[in-house]
Each structure stands twice: as structure tokens, then as C-alpha cells.
């Protein structure tokens, strides 16, 4: 059937959903991308013990997260509620910093070395977190 | 052994639609992204289409977009791609590949190809 | 898109020479590059991915190298089946974008 029911090979079970860790970089979008073509999504993340699960499996290198404000308001790829759920902004982030150089602001989100989250450049190629649920039937994500 | 057997592919006139198909075995076919590239005669290679193991993803080409559409079976361990409004330079021979490491990146396997030609 | 150039787009060498072909891309593709053999009226067939890790089954003489917008192809000694087109693919970006091909002859 369309439900999946254990992680495919190379992905990691956590609390019922499956993860999946990159080792190497991709802009935001290209990452989303891939996620997309596993069936997945860019890693939600909805608890403190799923930001330090991730965390772990990271370590203390710049990683996507399926959320983004490319549109206006921060949102989550899978659509979970960005206002009522878990942040876990560094201080004084998410800036929207233009002086980069590198055109516009900042409306995707990442882990940093620390773990905590900031704002960057979507071309940015940062590793990146996939993340499927188990036991949900087949959804397409919905479009950015 | 990993198996790939495209069909469906002929002759058709311009404007014309034609489906092919690629019968897959020897591996878990849900779990697998799949592609189709094409390869005009004497030329190279061009990536054509992706799609997601269950199906809820794809990928076009600008230069199919709107006209071609892939889609898979499961149950049937079989990829297709209908091709409709079909042009001059859509003549290749059709190429479906399975994917080797996630996000439909490389391709590890081929299929033996089916030519389609178009033309009047 | 990205637009993946090769060269030489032919070569013509003898067995047991050594071969290198390169691929430049039009903006950098990190390592999401893959290198293909293709003889007449086959498919292609995997030899590298990731720039540089070598498909199970390939021969040890092939190997890649590179990263970012520069790939190279090497055959430290070329064999007599490994007269072909080869081709190199980035996969970093949709859409997916193949070289034009560089052909390897018998001098």
C-alpha cells in the first residue's frame, strides 16, 4: 500500500518519523528538491527533543530546515503552524540581513554550528535534513 | 539482476501523442525515484523527467513541460510518460534510468531504450 | 540552467595511454557530478558519481576528481573497451544538464 511502514535503507527512525543526512551542500530550494524526489520533506521541527535529535546527527554544521519566508511570512514546508510552534532563533535572528552582498535578504532558515537556528541566503549550498513520517499515507508536499 | 525494458516507442506524425512504458524488476521499484532522458540521433544526452518512488513528485524539462507527463504503477513495477503534441525535435531514442542515491541524482541503471520518431 | 561544457569534444589515443577529459560547469555544482561511458547503440553506463567515487563494478583505472565548476575524467591506462563518448552530468540543479560529449578513438 502507500503506507511506509519502517525507514528506507540509509535513513534513521526517530519517534516515528524517518530522517535522512546529507554530507553535502545544496542551495535551499535544490535541497527542498531532493526531499521532495524521496518522498519527504525538508526537516519540521516541532519539539526541543527533536531539535537536539537532529542537533546530534548534525553536529556543529550549517544545515537547511524545511522552513522559510520566501513569501512573506515564515512557513513550514509541511504546513505546520510556524507562529504557535517550537523556534529556536540565535538571538536577534532571524535579521533578514541585507548586507551580505549577494542580493535581497535572508528567507531560509538553518541550523548553525551551535544548533540554534538563523536567516540566510537560499543559495547558500548548506547540508540539509530530509524527513518522512511513518505510518501516513502518501501526500505530495504542498507548493512553496 | 536489475532490469529495465522500455517500449512504446514509433513512428507518429507531428501533433501526434504516444506513451511509453519502462517495465522495471530486481528491485524495489516503489522505493526508487525514477528518470527519462533522451538522446537525439547522433547527438547527446538531455534529462527529460523525474519522478518520486510514490509518485507524488515530478520533474520536467522546460522543453516538455505542459506536453509530456510522467507517471508510474506500483503495482505493476512499470514507469510511463505520455507524450502529447509531439514535435520534430522530440525524435530520440527514450531512455528510462533508475535512480542510484536519493533525489533522482545519478543513474545507475538503464533500460535499452525505445526510439520514437516523429515526423510526417 | 547550467550549462556543462567538455573537452576535448574528441580524442584520439592508444591503449595503455593515459586519457583526461574535463567538464566545466556554468556556476559551481558543489560535487554533483557524474561520468558516463556510452558506446554506439548501448545505453550509457554509471563510472562515477559524486565527482569522484567510483561505481561498484567500474575498473579502478577510471577515477574523477574536481568540485565546484572544474571535473576531470581519468583513464591511467586505456584499454581496448574503453573506446566510447563519454559524458558528464551535473545534479545540483533542476534541471539535470549532460555535457555534449567527448568521444575517445583508436589512434
Known amino acids: 500500500g502507500s503506507e511506509r511502514t519502517c525507514c528506507p535503507v540509509n535513513w534513521v527512525e526517530h519517534e516515528r518519523s524517518c530522517y535522512w543526512f546529507s554530507r553535502s551542500g545544496k542551495a535551499w530550494a535544490d535541497a527542498d528538491n531532493y526531499c521532495r524526489l524521496e518522498d519527504a520533506h525538508l526537516v519540521v521541527v516541532t519539539s526541543w527533543e527533536e531539535q537536539k535529535f537532529v542537533q546530534h546527527h548534525i553536529g556543529p554544521v550549517n544545515t537547511w530546515m524545511g522552513l522559510h519566508d520566501q513569501n512573506g511570512p515564515w512557513k513550514w514546508v509541511d504546513g505546520t503552524d510556524y507562529e504557535t510552534g517550537f523556534k529556536n532563533w540565535r538571538p536577534e535572528q532571524p535579521d533578514d540581513w541585507y548586507g551580505h552582498g549577494l542580493g535581497g535578504g535572508e528567507d531560509c532558515a538553518h541550523f548553525t554550528d551551535d544548533g540554534r537556528w538563523n536567516d540566510d541566503v537560499c543559495q547558500r549550498p548548506y547540508r540539509w535534513v530530509c524527513e518522512t513520517e511513518l505510518d501516513k499515507a502518501s501526500q505530495e508536499p504542498p507548493l512553496l | 539482476e536489475v532490469q529495465l525494458l522500455e517500449s512504446g516507442g514509433d513512428l507518429v506524425q507531428p501533433g501526434g501523442s504516444l506513451r511509453l512504458s519502462c517495465a522495471a524488476s530486481g528491485f524495489t521499484f516503489s522505493s526508487c525515484a525514477m528518470t527519462w532522458v533522451r538522446q537525439a540521433p547522433g547527438k547527446g544526452l538531455e534529462w527529460v523527467s523525474a519522478i518520486s518512488g510514490r509518485g507524488g513528485t515530478t520533474f520536467y524539462a522546460d522543453s516538455v513541460r505542459g506536453r509530456f507527463t510522467i507517471s508510474r504503477d506500483n503495482s505493476k513495477n512499470t514507469l510511463f510518460l505520455q507524450m502529447n503534441s509531439l514535435r520534430a525535435e522530440d525524435t530520440a531514442v527514450y531512455y528510462c534510468?533508475?535512480?542510484?542515491?536519493?533525489?533522482?541524482?545519478?543513474?545507475?541503471?538503464w533500460g535499452q531504450g525505445t526510439l520514437v520518431t516523429v515526423s510526417s | 540552467d547550467i550549462q556543462m561544457t567538455q573537452s576535448p569534444s574528441s580524442v584520439s589515443a592508444s591503449v595503455g595511454d593515459r586519457v583526461t577529459i574535463t567538464c566545466r560547469a556554468s556556476?559551481?555544482?558543489?560535487?554533483?557530478l557524474a561520468w558516463y561511458q556510452q558506446k554506439p547503440g548501448r545505453a550509457p553506463k554509471l563510472l562515477i558519481y559524486?565527482?569522484?567515487s567510483l561505481q561498484s563494478g567500474v575498473p579502478s583505472r577510471f577515477s574523477g576528481s574536481g568540485s565546484g565548476t572544474d571535473f576531470t575524467l581519468t583513464i591511467s591506462s586505456l584499454q581496448p573497451e574503453d573506446f566510447a563518448t563519454y559524458y558528464c552530468?551535473?545534479?545540483?540543479?533542476?534541471?539535470?544538464?549532460f555535457g555534449q560529449g567527448t568521444k575517445v578513438e583508436i589512434k
Open positions: 559524486d565527482a569522484s
Open positions: 556556476q559551481g555544482v558543489n560535487d554533483w
Open positions: 552530468q551535473q545534479a545540483n540543479s533542476f534541471p539535470w544538464t
Open positions: 534510468a533508475k535512480d542510484l542515491i536519493g533525489g533522482a541524482t545519478y543513474f545507475d541503471y
